[in-house]
């Protein structure tokens, strides 16, 4: 389970309410740190192990998830075609 414990407002850009969120996540046995719906989350460790990143549902609802080549990360494709790429070190 994760909860937002701090929301840092970006005052220089008023239309962007929250620039950064700090989450506190307490993972259960068999879970480790991941991303779900573009937020920090605890996910099944087997997803991380097998690098099936899209199984943790990392993209926002309505976006499409695809694995990068060599499973080095994933892309989230918005309905308009914009692509966000996340690589895992």
């Amino acid at each position: 389970t994760c909860e937002v414990i701090a929301a840092h407002r970006d005052s220089s850009q008023p239309r962007r309410t929250i620039a950064r969120q700090t989450a506190r996540c307490a993972c259960r046995k068999g879970q480790i740190a991941g991303t779900t719906r573009a937020r920090p989350a605890c996910v099944d460790a087997r997803i991380i192990k097998t690098k099936q990143w899209c199984d943790m549902l990392p993209c926002l609802e309505g976006e499409g998830c695809d694995l990068l080549i060599n499973r080095s990360g994933w892309t989230c494709t918005q309905p308009g075609g914009r692509i966000k790429t996340t690589t895992v070190s």
Epitope: A26, K29, G30, Q31, I32, A33, A45
Partner: antibody, heavy 129, light 104 residues
Framework: AVTLDESGGGLQTPGGALSLVCKAS????????MFWVRQTPGKGLEYVAE????????NYGSAVKGRATISRDNGQSTVRLQLNNLRAEDTGTYFC??????????????????????WGHGTEVIVSS | ALTQPSSVSANPGETVKITCSGG???YGWFQQKSPGSALVTVI????ERPSDIPSRFSGALSGSTNTLTITGVQADDEAVYFC???????????FGAGTTLTVL
């Protein structure tokens, strides 16, 4: 190099208490779940206790539940096992171990017995009158 | 409880397979040359090998059974091999009783 150094073993009396300490070095201690595992003459390897990377969660094996307390000091890179009401069957070698997964900041993570990648040399405990 | 064979034997150069089943999450394999002596992880997280462990050691998971394979076994590999994982309920760690590997 990752090193885990246990201390505090020795001859103990039945009904007494012992405190074992594991001093860690060579890695970011606060990011890893830690374990105590023992090897007793009659039972092979036995899970004793574990603690999450941030110390917020603890778990104990059935043989020591109610008698054991595991704690950690991330500032000192130490993990401690307190065992009370000692019995003869607590005799054995006690090992400190590290779970390999490096938990990122903002997360509290358990270790996994199958992910133990480093062990201490062990400290011998003998419970006898 | 985990199930692993109590003993296996092989000639130098042969391939040895030791199985472990009955757990959940991930499996590790731990080598011990004599009782009470140091434990050495040869495989962790199903198939990961520490950098100082020879490549002849490998691990593979199939369902809830993990297999430790030693390809081209050497005299120095003679030891007891314990498997470790979480119990089926995922509430505590559990270890196998150990498999004694004898190199003939």
């Amino acid at each position: 190099a990752v090193t885990l150094d246990e201390s505090g073993g020795g001859l103990q009396t039945p009904g007494g208490a012992l405190s074992l300490v594991c001093k860690a070095s060579g890695f970011t201690f606060s990011s890893h779940g830690m374990f105590w595992v023992r090897q007793t003459p009659g039972k092979g390897l036995e899970y004793v206790a574990e603690i999450t990377n941030d110390g917020s969660g603890t778990n104990y094996g059935s043989a020591v539940k109610g008698r054991a307390t595991i704690s950690r000091d991330n500032g000192q890179s130490t993990v401690r096992l307190q065992l009370n009401n000692l019995r003869a069957e607590d005799t054995g070698t006690y090992f400190c171990a590290r779970s390999t997964y490096e938990c990122p900041g903002g997360f509290s993570c358990w270790g996994d017995t199958g992910q133990i990648d480093a062990w201490g040399h062990g400290t011998e405990v003998i419970v006898s009158s | 409880a985990l199930t692993q064979p109590s003993s296996v034997s092989a000639n130098p150069g042969e391939t040895v397979k030791i199985t472990c089943s009955g757990g959940s999450y991930s499996y590790g394999w731990f080598q011990q040359k004599s009782p009470g002596s140091a434990l050495v992880t040869v495989i962790y997280w199903d198939d990961e090998r520490p950098s100082d462990i020879p490549s002849r050691f490998s691990g593979a998971l199939s369902g809830s059974t993990n297999t430790l394979t030693i390809t081209g076994v050497q005299a120095d590999d003679e030891a007891v091999y314990f498997c470790g994982t979480e119990d089926i309920s995922g509430t505590a760690g559990v270890f196998g009783a150990g498999t004694t590997l004898t190199v003939l």
